[in-house]
Structures are given as C-alpha cells and as structure tokens.
Amino acid sequence: DAEFRHDSGYEVHHQKLVFFAEDVGSNKGAIIGLMVGGVVIA
C-alpha cells in the first residue's frame, strides 16, 4: 500500500548564522567568531 500524505515528523528550526570580526588592537590581531542563535561557538 502507498503511504498517505503527511509532513515530515520533525520540525526544522531556522537559525541565523552571523560571522563577525572584531579588532582588539594592533598587536593582538583579530578575533573571528561564528555566532549561532546568539551564542558564540567559534
């Protein structure tokens, strides 16, 4: 028997990925980070 139509059984949550670079001074280089859902993860 064919399956009846239903949505996938899980929900996809869309989150904004924000890359940023922050200058912390001439002799300290820069911090490059990745923020996912408001939390810096890299």
């Epitope: 009846f4 239903h6 059984g9």
Partner: antibody
Framework: QVTLKESGPALVKPTQTLTLTCTFS??????????VGWIRQPPGKALEWLAH???????SYNPSLKSRLTISKDTSKNQVVLTMTNMDPVDTATYYC???????????????WGQGTTVTVSS | DVVMTQSPLSLPVTPGEPASISCRSS???????????LEWYLQKPGQSPQLLIY???NRFSGVPDRFSGSGSGTDFTLKISRVEAEDVGVYYC?????????FGQGTKLEIK
C-alpha cells in the same frame, strides 16, 4: 468557526452519476496544508474512506473505487466536489465530508465533519 | 489494504465503570515520518463522527480526560476511565498511514 455541509441529490438511479458538494467556512483551501476528504456510511454499517484533496490539488483515492471517483475543488467558492459514476444500490449511504490539515502544528486528523447527506440509489 | 479489527463489537457498561476497546491492524501503521496515524472517532446516535484521539494518544480539544489512547505497532487501545451516559455510541478506530485509509468495524457502547 469551522463548518462543513454536504449537498446533493437524495435519490439517484442505477448507472447514473452522483455529484456531491461540500461547502465549508472557517478555513480556506488556499492555506498550506489544508485538505478535505469524503467518507461514506451505508445504513447500519461501518465508515468507508473515499477520497481526499489537498490545497495544492494533490489527490488521493480509495483504490477499490478510484475508477469511479473524481474529487475537485473550487477554492474561491470554498467548495469540494465529489463525483461518483455508475451508481449502484450498494452505494446507498450517508456521505460525509471532513477537514484534515497537514503540518507539525496541526492535528493532522479529521477534526471537523459535515452533518452528512443521505443518498439512495434506486430505480 | 490495512484491515482494522476491533473488539468487542458490543460493550455494555455500567455508568462509573471503566471500558476498554481494542483495535488491531493487519500490518504496521508506522508512517515513514515516524508517526503512527491511529485515530479514534465516536459516532453518537443520529450524529456525525467526532474526533476523540489522534496519533495514538493525543486527545482532541474538548475531549474529556477520562478518554485515553495507547498502543504501538499493530495493537491499540481506547480506554474510558469512568463511563458516563453521554458516552454511548459507536467507536471507530481509523488508520491514516496507508492508502486506502481504513476504519474498524465499530464498537457499540451501551449503558447497562
């Protein structure tokens, strides 16, 4: 509030084509995930699923009746139409339409039903 | 087709007592999306069917909490913890996982 109402002839002759209309309010068939189906119940017997149509015009039929059934929709009129060809006395039943909506935040079950319309097939 | 078999077909119950209806499917009704689309409907005398339980164990809005559904695979149960007079009618299990969608034969609950 959500309502559905079936309409059509009370009596049809054998070999004729039955046309039933489900007119609904309180929701729209242009809404993503929305669908309307047909179910019938012969006198004193169990329920039998016939067909279903979705907002995107995808359709599903009971294979045992597929050659006789056509389901269609008129979104602007808030109507779903079921036609059944070559009617026979065994098709005498109460015919119901019911709403079913896909979606993770939806019930995904037949949550609202019409009152039913009784069709007798006799010469 | 998936055959849905209910038992008992007739169920006389004394008000205040519990009641249980069994529904067995001839094959698994687990959908590929991980959900089991097993539903219970009640058809009160002279009325249209009404939804009680969806996806095995979820009560529809407005359904009293004395109704509960359980099961998995091919074995499902509807329980009424304390039957009331207004619960009389025919109870149908229904699977919406595979085409054709199919109902059980119905269980007629009556008050003793």
């Amino acid at each position: 509030q959500v309502t559905l109402k079936e309409s059509g002839p009370a009596l049809v002759k054998p070999t004729q084509t039955l046309t039933l209309t489900c007119t609904f309010s309180g929701f729209s068939l242009s809404t993503s995930g929305m669908g309307v189906g047909w179910i019938r119940q012969p006198p004193g017997k169990a329920l039998e699923w016939l067909a279903h149509i979705w907002w995107d015009d995808d359709k599903s039929y009971n294979p045992s009746l597929k050659s006789r059934l056509t389901i269609s929709k008129d979104t602007s009129k808030n109507q779903v139409v079921l036609t059944m060809t070559n009617m026979d006395p065994v098709d005498t039943a109460t015919y119901y339409c019911a709403r079913r909506q896909l979606g993770l935040r939806s019930i995904d079950a037949m949550d609202y039903w019409g009152q039913g319309t009784t069709v007798t097939v006799s010469s | 087709d998936v055959v849905m078999t209910q038992s008992p077909l007739s169920l006389p119950v004394t008000p205040g007592e519990p009641a249980s209806i069994s529904c067995r499917s001839s094959q698994s009704i687990l959908h590929s999306n991980g959900n089991t689309y097993l539903e219970w409907y009640l058809q009160k005398p002279g009325q249209s069917p009404q939804l009680l339980i969806y996806k095995v164990s979820n009560r529809f809005s407005g359904v009293p909490d004395r109704f509960s559904g359980s099961g998995s695979g091919t074995d499902f149960t509807l329980k009424i913890s304390r039957v009331e007079a207004e619960d009389v009618g025919v109870y149908y299990c229904f699977q919406a996982s595979r085409v054709p969608l199919t109902f059980g034969q119905g269980t007629k609950l009556e008050i003793k």
